[in-house]
């Protein structure tokens, strides 16, 4: 699986989920979250040659397309599979808020 | 939606489902198949700005981080969203026998 | 330039509910809290509720009974504000009011037009 | 809930005097180092506009006539110089506790 635990301690170039730390204020403009600052979101980046990870059987048609037609612009693309939840405290005046933001962490990556 | 009638009708440059016509003998080497000669498999492509056609709550961060940080190479990126069978028939000998391919034309696109 | 454009004007019979949409323009509608205050004829401000637009959080005045629903719509960046069991105590002029960013609760520095709602059989 | 009173309910005002209005908190609406209280006019038939944030920070694009004062419980909004333009319904607004809540208005 193109996982964490598989892409951190690699260095693949083909398709896998990389690092990405976001902080709410400077990288969202949200200032109202208390807790965290921000997190390891991750993101998805890499080509998807023909057989590598492949979603669907039309990610395997387009791969093998893309296989037999090199310079066409129809190609699968990396994006996230797994999909973690992000809890999160905010106050509400002086009550504080703890929220689960759902689908906010990528563990794992796809080519679709 | 970013669909086939939606996108086939309009010169839209963000993510949208754009034509691709396949020829199975040509552009994936399987000559097996009898009929069709080939089919409108369709692709996905174009740019996912804030607030096109996201995906998850994790697009929609990551669209807004990309806003934020233009220089990023985290975006998200225009994949299938609904797609639809194909029937096709082929040989055993003699014997013509018909099969449903799932999910082998891309009706509509996603931000993810 | 920022806009918040409300719907038109609505008369309700008592009993039955109205929605109240706020189309939003000139800014990241997923970045600020959308609150929706009330101003009955002649009277002062009541704060009904806000909502998250990114995950549809909400936070609600409990003056209104859980009457009120605040929903959002990310991709047309529409807040709506739906408020069910009318009676003639609802008459009034519905404002959404953009939170001005640093707090879930915090001071409105962009306001729609506003919307009135008749309650009348 | 906190409760906000405003004195005086209305004020006339000749032109190019100065006028103030009181805020009255029924509890301290200052937390983190921050008064959470903010002024509003509403000019009539108009939505209410936003003139002063956390006590005496003045909006952008509002005249600096107007100023703000005050902590904890007890809050001023001054004008200086008062024009015709500045007629309508002035507001206080405190968010240090939920529901946030407004006074009942000064004309």
């Known amino acids: 699986a193109l996982d964490t635990n598989y892409c951190f301690s690699s260095t693949e170039k083909n398709c896998c989920v990389r690092q990405l730390y976001i902080d709410f204020r400077k990288d969202l403009g949200w200032k109202w979250i208390h807790e965290p600052k921000g997190y390891h979101a991750n993101f998805c980046l890499g080509p998807c040659p023909y057989i590598w990870s492949l979603d669907t059987q039309y990610s395997k048609v387009l791969a093998l397309y893309n296989q037999h037609n090199p310079g066409a612009s129809a190609a699968p693309c990396c994006v996230p599979q797994a999909l973690e939840p992000l809890p999160i405290v905010y106050y509400v005046g002086r009550k504080p808020k703890v929220e689960q933001l759902s689908n906010m962490i990528v563990r794992s990556c796809k080519c679709s | 939606a970013l669909d086939t009638n939606y996108c086939f009708s309009s010169t839209e440059k963000n993510c949208c489902v754009r034509q691709l016509y396949i020829d199975f003998r040509k552009d994936l080497g399987w000559k097996w198949i009898h009929e069709p000669k080939g089919y409108h498999a369709n692709f996905c492509l174009g740019p996912c700005p804030y607030i096109w056609s996201l995906d998850t709550q994790y697009s929609k961060v990551l669209a807004l981080y990309n806003q934020h940080n233009p220089g990023a190479s985290a975006a998200p990126c225009c994949v299938p969203q609904a797609l639809e069978p194909l029937p096709i028939v082929y040989y055993v000998g003699r014997k013509p026998k018909v099969e449903q391919l799932s999910n082998m034309i891309v009706r509509s696109c996603k931000c993810s | 330039e920022v806009q918040l454009v409300q719907s038109g004007a609505e008369v309700k019979k008592p009993g039955a509910s109205v929605k109240v949409s706020c189309k939003t323009s000139?800014?990241?509608?997923?970045?600020?809290?959308m609150n929706w205050v009330r101003q009955a004829p002649g009277a002062g401000l009541d704060w009904m509720g806000q909502?998250?637009?990114?995950?549809?959080?909400?936070n609600y005045n409990e003056m209104f009974e859980g009457r009120v629903t605040l929903t959002a719509d990310t991709s047309t960046s529409t807040a709506y504000m739906e408020l069910s069991s009318l009676r003639a105590g609802d008459i009034a002029v519905y404002y959404c009011?953009?939170?001005?960013?640093?707090?879930?609760?915090?001071?409105?520095?962009?306001w729609g037009q506003g919307t009135l709602v008749t309650v009348s059989s | 809930d906190i409760v906000m009173t405003q004195t005086p309910p209305s004020l006339s005002v000749s032109p190019r005097e100065t006028a103030s209005i009181s805020c009255r908190a029924s509890?301290?609406?200052?937390?983190?180092?921050?008064?959470?209280m903010h002024w509003y006019l509403q000019k009539p038939g108009q939505s209410p506009q936003l003139l002063i944030y956390?006590?005496?920070n003045l909006e952008s694009g509002v005249s600096d006539r107007f100023s703000g004062s005050g902590s904890g419980t007890d809050f001023t909004l001054r004008i200086s110089r008062v024009e015709a333009n500045d007629t309508g319904v002035y507001y206080c607004?405190?968010?240090?506790?939920?529901?946030?809540?407004f006074g009942q208005g000064t004309k």
């Open positions: 909502i998250f637009p990114a995950w549809g959080m909400t």
């Open positions: 956390l006590a005496s």
């Open positions: 009011a953009r939170g001005y960013g640093n707090y879930a609760l915090d001071a409105m520095d962009y």
């Open positions: 000139g800014y990241t509608f997923i970045t600020y809290w």
């Open positions: 509890e301290s609406v200052d937390s983190y180092g921050n008064s959470f």
């Open positions: 607004q405190q968010n240090d506790e939920d529901p946030l809540s």
